[in-house]
Interface confidence: low
């Protein structure tokens, strides 16, 4: 029967004496007038077995003692602490010559456990073991006994047990206790990794090398390993496991995010709350559901605040000008939470007796700086029809307007276009050039913005860069320019008027008249 | 490099006494004990004992005890053997050899680095 | 004291040839055992510890076996740097007493 002792949790006792009940019943050879069990007192007044010899007085001592068989339970080097008083020499008279002051340590490895005899050819010796301090005996009956302790390992083992022996040559040797131990590094989680116990090696200086498992909840970011040293210490950890999406590490393991709380990512970080906006019914949640009317666009992160679309823009205000109409407005009261507002422009065409009746506007309309996607709170919108009815609406949009659209997010202005002048003449061409005429023609212009009252023809020698010029006009797209000088460079300028006033003048047709009475016909843009 | 210099051949009279040195060099003199063979002309090895190289305590065979003697100089790393009263069956090659000195399991048992040997002539 | 019997005497074998040596002890030593190699006028070197630990830069060719009293050491594919004498040594309770010797010859 063995009592409970407690020792560290690196070490793992296969023998100690001091917690046999009763006697130790070890061998001794020889099995007279050597090794002796018997009781004495310990530090605490307890009764504990010991093995003592004391034959100093006589030569030549050859005496053995040898332990019960020792299993190794696996380890490859074990640990032997002894616990020992030995008389010094000096404190004995009369035995110069015949004491010694050392014992000597030995072991033998066998699978046999139950050996009978000591054979001491069969034992290895450890070492010879000396006190660092021997004591000499004052005083027995105040109990005062100064014990020498002594730890030795031996390894590699091999075998399933061992037995240890003790030789005494001449000493007067009190074993008080003999620990038999080895050294594991024990069950331990470091970095959300578990480490089993683990054996040392066989040599003092060897490394073993473990391989942790995640804990629950958990994965490798790296290959978690440890080194169980020689002293049951572990060192040097490599590699570690991370709490899953939706756990946080608590005390070394992986607990569950709580209610109202959550985590995206197998990453070190806790459970944060969910964002504004959002909630998690469940613990473990990966991430927080969005409260009804609110969205998490595509590339919102998880911890982002679940958001809405906008509302409206305020106080649209129109300005038209002819075919033209700047818009501009303000920022919707309500950005929905998030920084990603923009503005699209929607332009229809509405006819002047229903305005149900609209239509998109189409491609020829023109938008400054953009029709979509504006960051301004303004825009030009350019090349309209006259006199048409117009409606614009300026819709606010962020990231999440998608997932629910409605008319709530978009203001709307309707306007009409006034008259406007006629566009620029596109082509005008000389048809006839003679010594002293030109005959110059064209088209209508593009947008004509109403009915053409005339055509205006500007015209002056080139050479005298428009100081001088002048003007002819006629109700007929053609036109002869009579009166002219030969062999002279002309430049010609056409443009239209309507009730609305003058279009713009076309690009200048330059044509140089001849010096010869024949006629040149053609109809290029410059004519010589 | 770890190495064992012995002495030189040594050639005696019956009744002398030679004394031959092991030197050893590149490791701890004190961590290994040093043991000495024999080995006579044409014969085997013979273990003739060992010398502790920490308390110069030495140990001898049943066949080497009385004229033989082990000894040290630990300051010059140097172990001795010195034989006395020479004989004629004396004659041989003596070894030195080291080993660990203390015992750590069987597996470091072996004698792993040995001097080149003293030859010792012994003749009238 | 433990006797060490080592077997053969001699052994007279050709290149490529394989051979094996043998030494039985009068009672367990419990693999303490070792292996030497000896050239004429050298001193031995150490072939194998603990009865099957080939010893640092000793070629594969050579292998130990055994367990209890009977103990082996085995030559593959024997190369001329092989031949000379081989002895056996144990380590179980002094004296350490080495095997006669194996004089191993060319044919």
């Known amino acids: 029967v063995t009592g409970s002792r407690v020792y560290p949790a690196n070490e793992v006792t296969l023998l100690d004496s001091r917690s046999v009940q009763g006697e130790l019943g070890w061998i001794a050879s020889p099995l007279e007038g050597g090794w002796e069990e018997v009781s004495i007192m310990d530090e605490k007044n307890t009764p504990i077995r010991t093995y003592q010899v004391c034959n100093v007085m006589e030569a030549s001592q050859n005496n053995w003692l040898r332990t019960d068989w020792i299993t190794r339970e696996g380890a490859q080097r074990v640990y032997i602490e002894i616990k020992f008083t030995l008389r010094d020499c000096n404190s004995l008279p009369g035995v110069m010559g015949t004491c010694k002051e050392t014992f000597n340590l030995y072991y033998y490895e066998s699978d046999n456990d139950k050996e009978r005899f000591i054979r001491e050819s069969q034992f290895g010796k450890i070492d010879t073991i000396a006190a660092d301090e021997s004591f000499t005996q004052v005083d027995i009956g105040d109990r005062i006994m100064k014990l020498n302790t002594e730890i030795r390992d031996v390894g590699p083992l091999s075998k399933k047990g061992f037995y240890l022996a003790f030789q005494d040559v001449g000493a007067c040797i009190a074993l008080v206790s003999v620990r038999v131990f080895y050294k594991k590094c024990p069950l331990t989680v470091r970095n959300l990794a578990q480490f089993p116990d683990t054996i040392t090696g066989a040599d003092t200086s060897s490394l073993v090398e473990v391989r942790g498992s995640c804990v629950n909840n958990s994965e490798e970011k790296d290959v978690p390993k440890m080194y169980c040293g020689a002293d049951g210490e572990w060192l040097v950890p490599i590699g570690n496991c991370l709490c899953n999406a939706g756990h946080e590490e608590q005390n070394g393991e992986c607990q569950a995010c709580k209610i109202g709380y959550y985590k995206a990512l197998s990453t070190d970080a806790s459970c944060a709350k969910c964002p504004p906006h959002s909630y998690s019914v469940w613990e473990g949640a990966t991430s927080c559901t969005c409260d009804r009317g609110f969205f998490r666009a595509d590339n919102d992160a998880a911890s982002m605040p679940c958001t809405r679309p906008p509302s409206a823009p305020l106080n649209l205000i129109s300005n038209v000008n002819e075919t033209s109409v700047n818009l501009e407005w303000s920022s919707p009261q309500n950005t929905g939470g998030r920084q990603d507002i923009s503005y699209n422009v929607v332009c229809k065409k509405c006819g002047a007796g229903d305005p149900s009746k609209c239509r998109p506007c189409g491609s020829g309309v023109h938008y400054t700086p953009q029709q979509n996607g504006l960051k301004t709170t303004r825009v030009s919108i350019t090349d309209l029809l006259a006199h048409t009815n117009y409606t614009f609406e300026i819709w606010a949009v962020n990231g999440v307007s998608k997932y629910n659209p409605s008319p709530d997010q978009s203001v709307s202005v309707t306007v009409t276009t006034n008259q406007a002048a006629p566009s620029s003449i596109a082509l005008v061409q000389a048809k006839e050039v003679t010594r002293y005429s030109v005959a110059l023609a064209w088209l209508e212009p593009d947008r004509p913005n109403g009915v053409i009252l005339e055509y205006e023809v500007k015209y002056y020698e080139k050479d005298q860069n428009e100081r001088s010029y002048r003007i002819v006009r006629t109700a007929a797209r053609n036109t002869d320019i009579k009166g002219l000088n030969p062999l002279t460079s002309y430049v010609f300028h056409v443009r239209a008027r309507t009730a609305a006033g003058y279009g713009d003048f076309s690009e200048p047709l330059e044509v140089t008249t001849n010096t010869v009475p024949s006629r040149i016909i053609g109809d290029g843009a410059n004519s010589t | 490099q770890i190495q064992l210099v012995q002495s030189g051949p040594e050639l005696k009279k019956p009744g002398e006494t030679v004394k031959i040195s092991c030197k050893a060099s590149?490791?701890?003199?004190?961590?290994?004990?040093m043991h000495w063979v024999k080995q006579a002309p044409g014969k085997g090895l013979k273990w003739m004992g060992w010398?502790?190289?920490?308390?110069?305590?030495?140990t001898y065979a049943d066949d080497f005890k009385g004229r033989f003697a082990f000894s040290l100089e630990t300051s010059a790393s140097t172990a001795y053997l010195q034989i006395n009263n020479l004989k004629n069956e004396d004659t041989a090659t003596y070894f030195c050899?080291?080993?660990?000195?203390?015992?750590?399991?069987?597996?470091?048992?072996?004698?792993?680095?040995w001097g080149a040997g003293t030859t010792v002539t012994v003749s009238s | 004291d433990i006797q060490m019997t080592q077997s053969p005497a001699s052994l007279s074998v050709s290149v490529g040839e394989t051979v094996t040596i043998t030494c039985r002890a009068s009672?367990?030593?419990?693999?303490?055992l070792a292996w030497y190699q000896q050239k004429q006028g050298k001193s031995p070197q150490l072939l194998v510890y603990?009865?099957?630990n080939l010893a640092d830069g000793v070629p594969s060719r050579f292998s130990g076996s055994g367990s209890g009293t009977q103990y082996s050491l085995k030559i593959n594919s024997l190369q001329s740097e092989d031949f000379g004498s081989y002895y056996c040594?144990?380590?179980?309770?002094?004296?350490?007493?080495f095997g006669g010797g194996t004089k191993l010859e060319i044919k």
């Open positions: 010398i502790n190289t920490e308390t110069g305590e030495p």
């Open positions: 009672e367990n030593i419990y693999r303490n």
């Open positions: 040594q144990h380590f179980w309770g002094t004296p350490w007493t």
């Open positions: 050899a080291r080993i660990p000195l203390y015992y750590y399991g069987s597996r470091y048992w072996y004698f792993d680095v």
């Open positions: 590149g490791y701890t003199f004190t961590d290994y004990s």
């Open positions: 603990a009865a099957t």
